[in-house]
């Protein structure tokens, strides 16, 4: 057992039938010594009496906030959780596996420029009874700073008969230095507590692997006189870190038919501009990637051709 | 450069560019590592980074370059000297074609823009002993190509910025 | 060039058993995932068992429990051995392997010339 915050404890569970479970001792948090007795939630059934409670923990239903109590009064509290553990690995009931890049992704991470700002986001089905805490860190053994905002509900999804949901962060590194070879990872650690199960997630990353710029900006389009050649131009998104003739960008480029079976030639530049055949009723889109580090493309920025 | 003079910007810039694309080359990003990469912090220690205090960023260079340059050279002689390491001619051997050879090739050609012949810099010295058994071999050399990567690039970025505002 | 040579196809009962071989020039080490594929006339090669560097096996539905892939790292070999073999199991069968690409810069994929097993009572 240990303490997840002031009142709240969190008791780790090998989970199989028949577990002896955890043998676990509360103490009412008093200067009182007599007439102290004990409850479970709302029920109010007196499961004993004294200073300490004994009580052997095997499922959900030892789990739940237990009240020492003297004349009616409530003295303290104590919030059991529990984190199962089933065949040595620790349960992930609540987060929806992403499956990408790899499987047991359960987080997902991205940053738009070097700054040290990072995004991450998380799936689960689950709608009511549920609280996220983030915690972060660059380093585990000897961690810098990392400070996390609030965890909010960032969309909404129907997936056939079930809803899902994802929740977001945004965590800014204290002392960034973007233009460095970073050496130790950045940790990401959610706790999530549904109802009384207690899990925790964990991410490790360098924000050089998780980099995925913005589309380019202001595509635009010029016709060449007498030509069926179109001059193409484009520029670097305004997220993406400065100056950019140290963080430099290089695009992919392609000019796609209204038919999506239609080949399409796909370009490398690492100009902002280019000259293609255009023709009416295709598009012409350009995506970004770091030119030196094979991270995320961006999206697509497109644009029709007419 | 030893002594203050410029590097030819334009000509590092070139090189460090393609010293990008073969580290890439040679380790792509894959979506699974089908030997364990990840291992504790300390792992990659022991192998030359450019820190936040070696004058790398844009600020820094215009003020001297000097101090970054050297780093990066540092950098450059102790990758040279891993790739040449039996780390990479052991089991399982690299073929004719290994795009390892031209970054092996690449890496010294770059410190050597970096340094012309009679001057020397101080180079750290470079990890022994190497692993036995091909399979440690082979998690070495991943991570010794995936910790390239991220050198090559910063590398890349201080030669591009520098071949656009420092060139005389 | 780096080869892959199969062996030890030939005629089996149903029910029979046989053990392919997939000896290559280089060490198996050198291959970030090797595979056996079969091929009958007239369709598409279909994929019969993969293991990855430091992996284990992965089978097709259609052979699990019958078949078995190991490798022998000192032969440079890795085999397919099969049992409880049926009529469908009747094809012209591949190794493959995929080098890493830090050993090479051309040609990742290498396959053999093929063995035939043919199933017959």
């Known amino acids: 057992i240990w303490e997840l915050k002031k009142d709240v404890y969190v008791v780790e569970l090998d989970w199989y039938p028949d577990a002896p479970g955890e043998m676990v001792v509360l103490t009412c948090d008093t200067p009182e010594e007599d007439g102290i007795t004990w409850t479970l939630d709302q029920s109010g059934e007196v499961l004993g009496s004294g200073k300490t409670l004994t009580i052997q923990v095997k499922e959900f239903g030892d789990a739940g906030q237990y009240t020492c109590h003297k004349g009616g009064e409530a003295l303290s509290h104590s919030l059991l959780l529990l984190h199962k553990k089933e065949d040595g690995i620790w349960s992930t009931d609540v987060l929806k596996d992403q499956k990408e890049p790899k499987n047991k992704t359960f987080l997902r991470c991205e940053a738009k420029n070097y700054s040290g700002r990072f995004t991450c986001w998380w799936l689960t089905t689950i709608s009511t009874d549920l609280t996220f805490s983030v915690k972060s860190s660059r380093g585990s053994s000897n961690p810098q700073g990392v400070t996390c905002g609030a965890v909010t509900l960032s969309a909404e999804r129907v997936r056939g008969d079930n809803k899902e949901y994802e929740y977001s962060v945004e965590c800014q590194e204290d002392s960034a230095c973007p233009a460095a070879e970073e050496r130790l990872p950045i940790e990401v650690m959610v706790d999530a507590i549904h109802k009384l199960k207690y899990e925790n997630y964990t991410s490790s990353f360098f924000i050089r692997d998780i980099i995925k710029p913005d589309p380019p900006k202001n595509l635009q389009l010029k016709p060449l006189k007498n030509s069926r050649q179109v001059e193409v131009s484009w520029e670097y998104p305004d997220t993406w870190s400065t100056p950019h003739s140290y963080f430099s960008l290089t695009f992919c480029i392609q000019v796609q038919g209204k038919s999506k079976r239609e080949k399409k030639d796909r370009i490398f530049t690492d100009k902002t501009s280019a000259t293609v055949i255009c023709r009416k009723n295709a598009s012409f889109s350009v995506q970004a990637q770091d030119r030196y580090y094979s991270s995320s493309w961006s999206e697509w920025a497109s644009v029709p051709c007419s | 450069v030893p002594g203050g003079s410029s590097p030819a910007w334009a000509q590092c810039q070139q090189l460090s560019q393609k010293l990008c694309t073969l580290a890439w080359s040679a380790h792509p990003l894959v979506g699974h590592m089908d030997l364990r990469e990840e291992g504790d912090e300390e792992t990659t220690n022991d192998v030359p980074h450019i820190q936040c205090g070696d004058g790398c960023d844009p600020q820094g260079l215009r003020d001297n370059s000097q101090f970054c340059l050297q780093r990066i050279r540092q950098g450059l002689i102790f990758y040279e000297k891993l790739l040449g390491s039996d780390i990479f001619t052991g089991e399982p051997s690299l073929l004719p074609d290994s795009p390892v050879g031209q970054l092996h090739a690449s890496l010294l050609g770059l410190s050597q823009l970096l340094q012309p012949e009679g001057h020397h810099w101080e180079t750290q010295q470079i990890p022994s002993p190497s692993p036995s058994q091909p399979w440690q071999r082979l998690l070495l050399r991943f991570k010794i190509l995936r910790s390239l990567q991220a050198f090559v690039a910063v590398a890349a970025r201080v030669f591009a910025h520098g071949a656009a505002t420092l060139s005389p | 060039e780096v080869q892959l040579v199969e062996s030890g196809g030939g005629l089996v009962q149903p029910g029979g058993s046989l053990r392919l071989s997939c000896a290559a020039s280089?060490?198996?080490?050198?291959?970030?995932?090797m595979g056996w594929y079969r091929q009958v006339p007239g369709k598409q090669r279909e994929l019969v068992a993969t293991?990855?560097?430091?992996?284990?096996?992965d089978y097709a539905d259609s052979v699990k429990g019958r078949f078995t892939m190991s490798r022998d790292y000192d032969k440079r070999t890795v085999f397919l051995e099969m049992d409880s073999v049926k009529p469908e199991d009747a094809a012209v069968y591949y190794c493959?392997?995929?080098?890493?690409?830090?050993?090479?810069?051309?040609?990742?994929?290498?396959w053999g010339q093929g063995t035939r097993v043919t199933v017959s009572s």
């Open positions: 493959n392997g995929r080098l890493w690409a830090h050993l090479t810069s051309s040609g990742h994929d290498v």
């Open positions: 293991i990855t560097t430091g992996g284990s096996p």
């Open positions: 280089v060490s198996i080490w050198s291959f970030k995932v």
